[in-house]
Amino acid sequence: VPRWRQQWSGPGTTKRFPETVLARCVKYTEIHPEMRHVDCQSVWDAFKGAFISKHPCNITEEDYQPLMKLGTQTVPCNKILLWSRIKDLAHQFTQVQRDMFTLEDTLLGYLADDLTWCGEFNTSKINYQSCPDWRKDCSNNPVSVFWKTVSRRFAEAACDVVHVMLNGSRSKIFDKNSTFGSVEVHNLQPEKVQTLEAWVIHGGREDSRDLCQDPTIKELESIISKRNIQFSCKNIYRPDKFLQCVKNPEDSSCTSEI
């Protein structure tokens, strides 16, 4: 008789999760010389230890302390790119502009990007059937706590001019409930961060509106200004051209507005 198992509302742990984390760690440390000292088996053990045998609605930031230790990585604080609801373009940008970093360009972010994981209380099993959904089940689940923790610390590390890429095609270009709106914005340090510069990415080919005037962008400006950080905003009307011009800045067509 199969043992009763808690049914959660969200998808289960990504298949081959242990192998994926380990393989990603090995790949990352091979590509990034400054992280060659990292012992990937220990990283996996620390990752596993954060959620295995624990109730998946009772995970805390401190459960990830061993992983935060082993994944410690100093990024240039003035080269940080945050994003909200436009991850793919943000990652395409940092793949070209190699001196800038999204969270997923760090070891900790790279390990967990697009993965789901959870365990079960008092058993060493990984739950591949279902994991808690943030809204329907609980917010203190392994995935949500991980991203809240690393996002907070990543934002805290930022300095000088911080850039954020926002999706101009969404009804809420700035969403207070996103990780950027609820965590990162509030953890930028006014003593270190001079300016938050938003890049609003347009979706439609013929969209010439100034989305920097959008009410949600004004809301973001208000939040940031109250924190004694300056705010600036740029429309990126043609994201394809924008990326092309990052690749080839001397191209003659790249002097006009993009």
Partner: antibody, heavy 122, light 111 residues
């Protein structure tokens, strides 16, 4: 409430031994590296030793290497410092502290005990 | 002799702004983050600033940290009598075994 409570200090003769304990409560002890820091009377802080969350890694200040041993018992939520071959210059208040990692910057010692006084004198 | 150099003393009157410096080298402050600790008379040290300039919850925003090159500084604005304490900077030194290093401490007197 997160708390660290040191004990085991006292008066000991040069060449003698002492074992300090640090009882942790209010947090998941086995998730954190722990450290000992000392302060000689009227002087500044001096780092002594650190141990990893699982006890596998240890590191010592040159001034105590070979004489002091840091250890922990995660089942008892307790940190230890075994001090052998004590010298007059080891006289200090010994503090245990929790090490907190931030992921994208160096760690800090974010929680401290109240300290226990060790006096080495004949 | 401490690896990180702090002035032994500093003073100010209530309401004033005072700054405490912490000088190091490329192998410590130049390549690692700095933490600051406050030690009130007769008590244990307390974390005041971590990662150069971040305040733990509960620390008033009168305290601020900054870093430039191989030096760090702690600024206290709107000085109060209860700020009278010893202040220590701390970093990591990649050239040393047992790499955790403290400054010698600065005794702040509120006149």
């Amino acid at each position: 409430e997160v708390q660290l409570l040191e004990s085991g200090g006292g008066l000991v003769q040069p060449g003698g031994s002492l074992r300090l304990s640090c009882a942790a409560s209010g947090f998941t002890f086995n998730n954190y590296d722990m450290t000992w820091v000392r302060q000689a009377p009227g002087k500044g802080l001096e780092w002594v030793a650190v141990i990893s969350y699982d006890g596998s890694d240890k590191d010592y200040a040159d001034s105590v290497k070979g004489r002091f041993t840091i250890s922990r018992d995660n089942s008892k939520n307790t940190l230890y410092l075994q001090m052998n071959s004590l010298r007059a210059e080891d006289t200090a208040v010994y503090y245990c502290a929790r090490v907190y990692y931030y992921g994208f910057s160096g760690p800090s010692m974010d929680v401290w005990g109240q300290g226990t006084l060790v006096t080495v004198s004949s | 002799q401490s690896v990180l150099t702090q002035p032994p003393s500093a003073s100010g009157t209530p309401g004033q702004r005072v700054t405490i410096s912490c000088s190091g080298s490329n192998s410590n402050i130049g390549s690692n983050t700095v933490n600051w600790y406050q030690q009130l008379p007769g008590t244990a040290p307390k974390l005041l600033i971590y990662s150069d300039s971040n305040r733990p919850s509960g620390v008033p925003d009168r305290f601020s940290g900054s870093k430039s090159g191989t030096s760090a500084s702690l600024a206290i604005s709107g000085l109060r009598s209860e700020d009278e304490a010893d202040y220590y900077c701390q970093s990591y030194d990649s050239s040393l075994s047992g790499s955790r290093v403290f400054g010698g401490g600065t005794k702040l007197t509120v006149l």
